[in-house]
């Protein structure tokens, strides 16, 4: 309950915060749990305690372990634990999952990526930023204070972003890197009364007797994820499944999201071996959502065979 996980890379600075909070004037004692050995407060040590903070300048793989902090208040002592893991630097570009900080989401309107844990360090701007190990260049990227701003965010901007900065302690500089994933989410969606794109209202569809015919019902419902949206076909006001004609079946087409962000659905009506009686039916394309229902009616007509006689 009073434990927090911290991690870092060998030869980089790592600063860890005691999970128990107290007043700035409270004394905080730190111990290495395995040996119960007190962590010194003298800054000349590579690992030293500074109030609520435990500093590894720089960190070594052997520093990994559980550290205990005790916040001494006037009436009781609060004990917390910092579970520290120091990893070897990877030779390749990939950042393993165990080194990743929490994923953040952005959108066209809000594309800030905060550099994780940076508030613990004594750093000066600017930060360096990398995406999938490549240094970010171009006017779309702006390093501002402790975060990166991306202008005109696109889905391709999703990926792993690493911030790199220098921690200064008593005139000595130490490198720090931190990586987190960035995902791009759609702007807040909205819902509209359904708009049927096809077929046109009262369309006449020419078909050939004995051949197969397809009718597509296509409608759009708004932008972004839709809570309730459906398209379907009816025959003479009856659902296809209830109509009982095995030659006539409907199957879902592709869910579409156009470049303008509209959320649309398709339903294809497949008529096998078109018969004369099919021309007498009324085919209704229905689109419905929370706003209501829209219906476009189609009728079939016989396609005149091409006259080959002169």
């Amino acid at each position: 309950k009073f434990s927090k996980q911290s991690w870092g890379l060998e030869n980089e600075a790592l600063i860890v915060r005691c999970p128990r909070q107290g007043k700035p004037s409270y004394t905080v004692d730190w111990y290495y749990s395995q040996t119960n050995k007190s962590i010194p407060t003298q800054e000349r040590n590579r690992v030293f305690a500074s109030g609520q903070l435990l500093k590894f300048l720089p960190a070594a793989v052997a520093d990994s372990g559980i550290y205990t902090c005790i916040v001494r208040s006037p009436t009781f002592n609060r004990t917390g634990y910092a579970n520290v893991t120091i990893y070897k630097k990877q030779s390749d570009c990939n950042v393993p999952d165990y080194l990743m900080y929490s994923t953040v989401s952005g959108s066209e309107k809000n594309s800030k990526i905060y550099c994780p844990t940076i508030d613990l360090y004594n750093w000066t701007a600017p930060l360096e930023w990398f995406k999938n190990c490549q240094a970010l260049q171009g006017s779309r990227y702006r390093a501002h204070k402790s975060f990166l701003v991306i202008d005109n965010v696109m889905t391709e901007d999703a990926g792993d972003y690493t911030c790199k900065f220098i921690h200064n302690e008593n005139g000595a500089n130490y490198s720090v890197t931190a990586t987190r994933s960035f995902t791009v989410k759609d702007e807040q969606g909205f819902s509209l009364f359904p708009v049927i794109g096809a077929p046109a209202q009262n369309e006449i569809k020419e078909v050939e007797i004995g051949k197969n015919a397809n009718l597509t019902c296509s409608a759009c419902f708004g932008k972004g994820t839709q809570f309730l949206a459906a398209v379907l076909w009816q025959l003479n006001g009856t659902k296809i499944t209830d109509f009982g004609e095995p030659r006539i079946q409907q199957e879902e087409g592709q869910n579409q999201s156009f470049s303008n962000g509209l959320a649309c659905l398709d339903m294809v009506l497949r008529i096998a071996d078109v018969k004369e009686e099919d021309l007498l039916l009324q085919y209704d394309c229905l689109a419905l959502n929370l706003h209501g229902l829209r219906r476009h009616t189609v009728r079939l007509s016989r396609k005149n065979p091409i006259d080959h006689h002169s």
Epitope: K1, F2, K4, R17, P19, R20, Q21, K23, P24, S25, Y26, T27, R72, S73, P74, T75, G80, D119
Partner: antibody, heavy 116, light 113 residues
Framework: QVQLVQSGAEVKKPGASVKVSCKAS????????MNWVRQAPGQRLEWMGW????????TYGDNFKGRVTITRDTSASTAYMELSSLRSEDTAVYYC?????????WGQGTLVTVSS | DIVMTQSPDSLAVSLGERATINCKSS????????????LAWYQQKPGQPPKLLIY???TRESGVPDRFSGSGSGTDFTLTISSLQAEDVAVYYC?????????FGGGTKVEIK
Amino acid sequence: QVQLVQSGAEVKKPGASVKVSCKASGYTFINYGMNWVRQAPGQRLEWMGWINTYIGEPTYGDNFKGRVTITRDTSASTAYMELSSLRSEDTAVYYCAREGDAFAYWGQGTLVTVSS
Amino acid sequence: DIVMTQSPDSLAVSLGERATINCKSSQSLLYSGNQNNYLAWYQQKPGQPPKLLIYGASTRESGVPDRFSGSGSGTDFTLTISSLQAEDVAVYYCQNDHSYPYTFGGGTKVEIK
């Protein structure tokens, strides 16, 4: 600069619950605990409890245990105080105040009126 | 719980004169671990949240005029306004910042005579 902005005034019926929010800005939210203090009309200030914003551990004053719930959302840098089973004596201004050596930063206050 | 008792309840002082407010705690607010007295003083004006003036019994919060000073140790504490100004008209509270539950005094109303 440090700012604590609280949600607006509420009018509640006896027996109901109220949830007050306190959005922090101008500092790293998880670095400091958040206290809740209330002030009934003509009464002294009364400490309700606080939350360790780093690990989410709350501590409640004895007078409020069982009725108060203090939570936080680190992604929104916001602390919340929910008081249940409201009675007319709970009519008060509720403040959030940042922990430190005493309370140097306070929210503007949220007036909660309990009336049938 | 630590009970904080303030005196007087109200105080009328001429502009430029000294105002003294006392606060007594039912238990010592001195922490032997660091020799700090965990007592704070606040000023509150109508319709506003309290404003921290003094913490640690005698440390002035940054931005607070130096006419405000705090003293005392253990269970007896004093807030002094050396030369009262018109803007100092308010209610003043002492607070136990030592142990839970943090408790406040009943307040002292300072007015101009």
